[in-house]
């Protein structure tokens, strides 16, 4: 009973460097505590962008200095990543872990390719 995680293939960040996507998981168990991690894969390097553990029915709480925010609804997590620049373009992978009660389950999505385009500077107006 492996856990399946679905996320959109492509998302375009806004001109303000904000990207949002939904991470949905098919829970094989009756988890009450879930951990969601966003991983960024670029040039075969993988880094952790942010992570949050939440109780089912409660809000996600990321660290204060995190670039991520999110909300949960059932087996769906709505993730928002802010402060993105063109150099942050890459594959953002949603990782879901059902932490409690045991057994533990791991689910990893195929990733969302987030494209970030830096806005053109406004020309000086006379």
């Amino acid at each position: 009973k492996a856990m399946h995680v679905a996320q959109p293939a492509v998302v375009l960040a806004s001109s303000r460097g904000i990207a949002s996507f939904v991470c949905e998981y098919a829970s094989p168990g009756k988890a009450t505590e879930v951990r969601v991690t966003v991983l960024r894969q670029a040039d075969s390097q993988v880094t952790e962008v942010c992570a949050a553990t939440y109780m089912m029915g409660n809000e996600l709480t990321f660290l204060d200095d995190s670039i991520c925010t999110g909300t949960s609804s059932g087996n769906q997590v709505n993730l928002t990543i802010q402060g993105l620049r063109a150099m942050d373009t890459g594959l953002y992978i949603c990782k879901v872990e059902l932490m409690y009660p045991p057994p533990y389950y791991l689910g990893i999505g195929n990733g969302t390719q987030i494209y970030v385009i830096d806005p053109e500077p406004c020309p000086d107006s006379d």
Epitope: K1, M3, P28, V46, Y104, Y105, L106, I108
Partner: antibody
């Protein structure tokens, strides 16, 4: 260099206790879940216990539940395994292993031998 | 618990030959399967994760395939240093389990 070094193994009598340690270096220890895995002489690998990065979540194999306790000290970059009520079948090399970002055990220590015999 | 069964138990081959190792799960593990190499007196080393992704520094003669319940590790041309014991592991759910191992020995 990313490294895990186990210590604390030795010879102990049945019913005795032992505390294993694993010292981590070369990576941000507090960001990773950690495991203990054992290997009896001439046998395969057996997962023993797992602990999350902040110690909030702990899991044990049925074979050691109630006898072994996993813990960690992130300030000291160290992982521990307290083993009580030891049995002959606990004789094995004990490895600590890091859980990689995608889930597999990507870094292993060299192991420490535990022998339970009268 | 998910039981992993590896076959064959022992594979006798010569350097330069192709090795094909099998791992079968008692229930689906999706692609949450890794392969490890262990040499005598050494710790296991991660070769493959996600069923088919090579770990850092692993040569491309090692490849993995499969999903669900049936998985294969292939070593295209055996080098002298490849003779070892290979274990599969599922990490999609607890308890984390390993196969019993396949020994690749020199013929």
């Amino acid at each position: 260099e990313v490294q895990l070094v186990e210590s604390g193994g030795g010879l102990v009598k049945p019913g005795g206790s032992l505390r294993l340690s694993c010292a981590a270096s070369g990576f941000t220890f507090s960001s990773y879940s950690m495991n203990w895995v054992r290997q009896a002489p001439g046998k395969g690998l057996e997962w023993v216990s797992s602990i999350s990065s902040s110690s909030s979540y702990i899991y044990y194999a049925d074979s050691v539940k109630g006898r072994f306790t996993i813990s960690r000290d992130n300030a000291k970059n160290s992982l521990y395994l307290q083993m009580n009520s030891l049995r002959a079948e606990d004789t094995a090399v004990y490895y600590c292993a890091r859980v990689g970002l995608f889930g597999p055990f990507d870094i292993w220590g060299q192991g420490t031998m535990v022998t339970v015999s009268s | 618990e998910i039981v992993l069964t590896q076959s064959p138990g022992t594979l006798s081959l010569s350097p330069g030959e192709r090795a094909t190792l099998s791992c079968r799960a008692s229930q689906s593990v999706s692609r949450y399967l890794g392969w490890y190499q262990q040499k005598p007196g050494q710790a296991p080393r991660l070769l493959i994760y996600g069923a088919s992704t090579r770990a850092t520094g692993i040569p491309d003669r090692f490849s993995g395939s499969g999903s669900g319940t049936d998985f294969t590790l292939t070593i295209t041309r055996l080098e002298p240093e490849d003779f070892a014991v290979y274990y599969c592991q599922q990490y999609g759910s607890s308890p984390w389990t390993f196969g019993q191992g396949t020994k690749v020995e020199i013929k």
